[in-house]
């Protein structure tokens, strides 16, 4: 549809999201020095985060730190923080990795390990690898709604990707439902060529694309949605360069007057819906 | 990733001089912090010098003014100059480098051995009375 006549325009557009599914969680915790399997459901509320742009999150995986409180203790053991005298611990240092203000005492860790004591929110968060397979695997069985709407305000022209009689039971498919808003998390993946279960473990960053070619003349008009995905964060990133997507958030509460916190660091999808085109009229 | 290869070992009397030479293979040598280390028979591994990519050292106190450590990033080698030997000073003496290239090993931290990845397999330093 690009005629040499027609007046272009770029598309300005605004992007509401829904998510929708439930993933049953079995969490393998230890209670007074037993493993014991805890069988959860999460919602939406428990998956999703607000974010701000044109982007969604859902959790696939996650680590928790319990019972945290600020006190003196030993610093996980790592290279950085295992220690043979108080020489190897400096007071009031703060190592960009470390998590906690160094004190300058070297003391037991567990058996004849010694670390650096901090103070910090203790007991230190381990280093540790993310759950194999996802928590949230199921997650690629979650629905994601997206509402889109577009304007070409030098030619009063507005509309959206979502048209009066939609069925809103149906799903994405590039070749026999590719107007359908609703798309399959796992069926995004599998257009980019990636396998959810795997990206799912470390998170990652994907892209959906929406791409308006509008031809915006009475008499040849036409102005849908063309939906494509890209995998947008590196899949080669070795360990060193902390692979996929994840962040620490904190859940904070009350115990016998004492403020105390639950540490997750989360691991999951962020979807990046990135909207482009051009409107053109005569 | 680096391989260390320790020379310059033997048998030197008391009060004698012995130079060891620490060879690393791997082209971002100058990223990496240099350490000796020696262990004696039923003894711990102890820390000798050290010297950092930007040239800070750090010495025992066993060794302090006896021994000098150095870096030729040139010829990826870091000597270690001993000086004064005594039969205490008998040892397996180990090379270790310690990447820094995502941080810089703190100068407090340059006597630890966990700071340290690679290893080399030791030269023998006999000092007889």
């Known amino acids: 549809s690009d005629k040499l006549y027609q007046r272009k325009e770029p598309v300005i557009s605004s992007v509401h999201t829904k998510v929708k599914g439930i993933a049953e969680v079995k969490e393998e915790i230890v209670e007074n020095g037993v493993k014991k399997l805890v069988h959860s459901v999460f919602d939406t509320a428990d998956y999703t985060f607000p974010l701000q742009g044109n982007s969604f999150f859902v959790m696939t995986n996650f680590l928790k730190t319990e019972g945290q409180e600020q006190r003196l203790c030993p610093e996980y053991p790592t290279r950085r923080t295992l220690c043979s005298s108080d020489r190897g611990c400096k007071k009031g240092w703060m190592d960009p990795q470390s998590k906690g203000i160094q004190t300058g005492r070297c003391v037991v860790y567990e058996g004849n390990q010694k670390t650096c004591e901090v103070s910090a929110w203790c007991p230190i968060e381990a280093v540790e690898e993310a759950p194999r397979p996802a928590l949230l695997n199921s997650a690629e069985n979650f629905t994601v709604l997206i509402k889109n709407n577009i304007d070409f305000p030098g030619h009063n022209y507005t509309t959206r990707n979502i048209l009066p009689g939609l069925n809103i039971t149906c799903t994405f498919h590039k070749t026999q439902n590719p107007q359908c808003p609703i798309f399959r998390l796992g069926d995004i993946f599998r257009e980019t060529g990636d396998n959810f279960s795997d990206v799912a473990i470390q998170g990652g960053i994907m892209g959906i694309e929406i791409y308006w070619d509008c031809n915006l003349d009475r008499w040849f008009h036409h102005c849908r949605p063309k939906y494509s995905f890209r995998r947008l964060d590196d899949k080669t990133t070795n360990v060193s360069l902390y692979p996929g997507y994840n962040f620490r958030y904190a859940k904070y509460y009350k115990e016998n007057n004492v403020e105390k916190r639950t540490l997750i660091k989360v691991f999951g999808i962020r979807f990046d819906i990135l909207v482009f085109g051009t409107g053109g009229k005569f | 990733e680096v391989q260390l290869v320790e020379s310059g070992g033997g048998l030197v009397q008391a009060g004698g001089s012995l130079r060891l030479s620490c060879a690393a293979s791997g082209r971002t040598f100058r990223h990496y912090a240099m350490g000796w280390f020696r262990q004696a028979p039923g003894k711990e591994r102890e820390f000798v010098a050290a010297?950092?990519?930007?040239?800070?050292?750090d010495y025992g106190d066993s060794v302090k003014g006896r021994f000098t450590i150095s870096r030729d990033d040139a010829k990826n080698t870091v000597p270690l100059q001993m000086n004064s030997l005594k039969p205490e000073d008998t040892a397996v003496y180990y090379c270790a480098a310690a990447d820094e290239t995502l941080g810089a090993v703190p100068n407090f931290r340059l006597h630890e051995k966990y700071e340290y990845e690679y290893w080399g397999q030791g030269t023998q330093v006999t000092v007889s009375s």
């Open positions: 010297i950092s990519s930007y040239g800070s050292t």
